[in-house]
C-alpha cells in the first residue's frame, strides 16, 4: 500500500490521543535503556510503511502484536485516514485469522514495540528532512 495520500495530521492526532498511551502500557516495566532502535524511516509515508510492517506482520519470536489494543487502533486509524487502505487489508486479515495464536508478551515483542515507538516519533516529527 502507498501511504502517500494519507491524512498525516489526523493519524498523528489518533496516535497521540490513544495509540501512544497503549504502547507505553505495553512497555511498562521495561527499562528505557533496554533496546536500541535499529529500524528508521525518512519521511511520513515511509514511516507508515515500516509501522504497518512491524505492527501487523508476524516475526520470529513475536507473532501476536496484531491483536494488541495499539495494533487495532493503528489499523482503525489507517483505515479511516488512508484512502483505499481497508481494501488492501482484507486478504491479510483473513490470513491472520487462520494463524491466530494466544497472546504472549515475549522479549522479542517488547523489542519490536520499542522499535514502533521510535518509528512513530519520526512520523510525528520528520524534522530531519526540511518540511
Amino acid at each position: 500500500y502507498d501511504f502517500t495520500n494519507c491524512d498525516f495530521e489526523k493519524i498523528k492526532a489518533a496516535y497521540l490521543s490513544t495509540i501512544s498511551k497503549d504502547l507505553i502500557t505495553y512497555m511498562s516495566g521495561t527499562k528505557s535503556t533496554e533496546f536500541n532502535n535499529t529500524v528508521s524511516c525518512s519521511n511520513r509515508p515511509h514511516c507508515l510503511t515500516e509501522i504497518q510492517s512491524l505492527t501487523f506482520n508476524p516475526t520470529a519470536g513475536c507473532a501476536s502484536l496484531a491483536k494488541e489494543m495499539f495494533a487495532m487502533k493503528t489499523k482503525a486509524a489507517l483505515a479511516i485516514w488512508c484512502p483505499g487502505y481497508s481494501e488492501t487489508q482484507i486478504n491479510a486479515t483473513q490470513a491472520m485469522k487462520k494463524r491466530r495464536k494466544r497472546k504472549v508478551t515475549t522479549n522479542k515483542c517488547l523489542e519490536q514495540v520499542s522499535q514502533l515507538q521510535g518509528l512513530w516519533r519520526r512520523f510525528n516529527r520528520p524534522l530531519l528532512k526540511q518540511q
Epitope: Y15, L16, S32, S40, S114, R121, L127
Partner: antibody
Framework: EVQLVQSGAEVKKPGSSVKVSCKAS????????IEWVRQAPGQGLEWIGV????????NYNENFKGRATLTADKSTSTAYIELSSLRSEDTAVYYC????????????WGQGTTVTVSS | DIVMTQSPDSLAVSLGERATINCKAS??????VTWYQQKPGQSPKLLIY???NHYTGVPDRFSGSGSGTDFTLTISSLQAEDVAVYYC?????????FGQGTKLEIK
C-alpha cells in the same frame, strides 16, 4: 533516571569558537533526538538545531547555518555543539534537550552552559 | 519562519485565581504546540504537549487548548510555585520557534 549533564561555563574572545558537551544517561542515547536551544541574558528561547544521534542526521536553524555544528558520540552518549566566529550577541545560556517519547516536545533538559563572549 | 506571539508579556494574578496566557501563530501550526515553564535560574520544564496533553507529573490545574493559530494555557487556581515565565513553542515547521515568554507573578 534520564539525565543530561552539560559542560561548564566558557569565556571566549570574539572570532573564536566554543564547544559545549551534553552527556546523556538513563536511556538509550541513539533512540532520541537531541535539541539545542539558547537563551540570551533576560531574553527568550531560541532553537539552534537538532541531531539524531542514531545516524548523525542534523537540521539547523538558518540563523546558525555555517556557524553551528552538531555532533554526537554514541560510544560516550554525548552530544556536542560547536559554535564558531563568536560575537558578543552569542553570549547566552546554551541548553541541550531530549525529545519526548512521542516526538512532539522536549521532556528532559540539561542544566545549561553559560557562554560569555567578550574582548 | 513562523512567529509565535504571546500575550500578555506579563501577568499578575492573585493566589487561587485563574491565569490565562495566549499564544498566536503567524500561520497555522495545526495542533503542534507545546508549553514550557521556566523558573528563575532553572532550565525550562515541559508542561503541555500537542496542545492539551499533560506531561507526566504536571498538576491538573494546568490545561492547554486551541488549534490552528490560536492557543491558550490556563492555570485554573494559581499557586505560589507557579510564578515563572511560560513559553509556547511550535514544532510544525522548521525552524522550531518559541513565543517571547509571559512572566507570571502573584498580585
Amino acid at each position: 533516571e534520564v539525565q543530561l549533564v552539560q559542560s561548564g561555563a566558557e569565556v571566549k574572545k570574539p572570532g573564536s569558537s566554543v564547544k559545549v558537551s551534553c552527556k546523556a544517561s538513563g536511556y538509550t542515547f541513539s533512540n532520541y533526538l537531541i535539541e539545542w536551544v539558547r537563551q540570551a541574558p533576560g531574553q527568550g528561547l531560541e532553537w539552534i538545531g537538532v541531531i539524531d544521534p542514531g545516524n548523525g542526521d542534523t537540521n539547523y536553524n538558518e540563523n546558525f547555518k555555517g556557524r553551528a555544528t552538531l555532533t554526537a558520540d554514541k560510544s560516550t552518549s554525548t552530544a556536542y555543539i560547536e559554535l564558531s566566529s563568536l560575537r558578543s550577541e552569542d553570549t547566552a545560556v546554551y541548553y541541550c534537550a531530549r525529545e519526548d517519547n512521542t516526538g512532539t516536545a522536549f521532556d528532559y533538559w540539561g542544566q545549561g552552559t553559560t557562554v560569555t563572549v567578550s574582548s | 519562519d513562523i512567529v509565535m506571539t504571546q500575550s500578555p508579556d506579563s501577568l499578575a494574578v492573585s493566589l487561587g485565581e485563574r491565569a490565562t496566557i495566549n499564544c498566536k501563530a503567524s500561520q497555522s501550526v495545526s495542533s503542534d504546540v507545546t508549553w514550557y515553564q521556566q523558573k528563575p535560574g532553572q532550565s525550562p520544564k515541559l508542561l503541555i504537549y500537542y496542545v492539551d496533553n499533560h506531561y507526566t507529573g504536571v498538576p491538573d490545574r494546568f490545561s492547554g487548548s486551541g488549534s490552528g493559530t490560536d492557543f491558550t494555557l490556563t492555570i485554573s487556581s494559581l499557586q505560589a510555585e507557579d510564578v515563572a515565565v511560560y513559553y509556547c513553542q511550535q514544532h510544525h515547521r522548521f525552524p522550531l520557534t518559541f513565543g517571547q515568554g509571559t512572566k507570571l507573578e502573584i498580585k
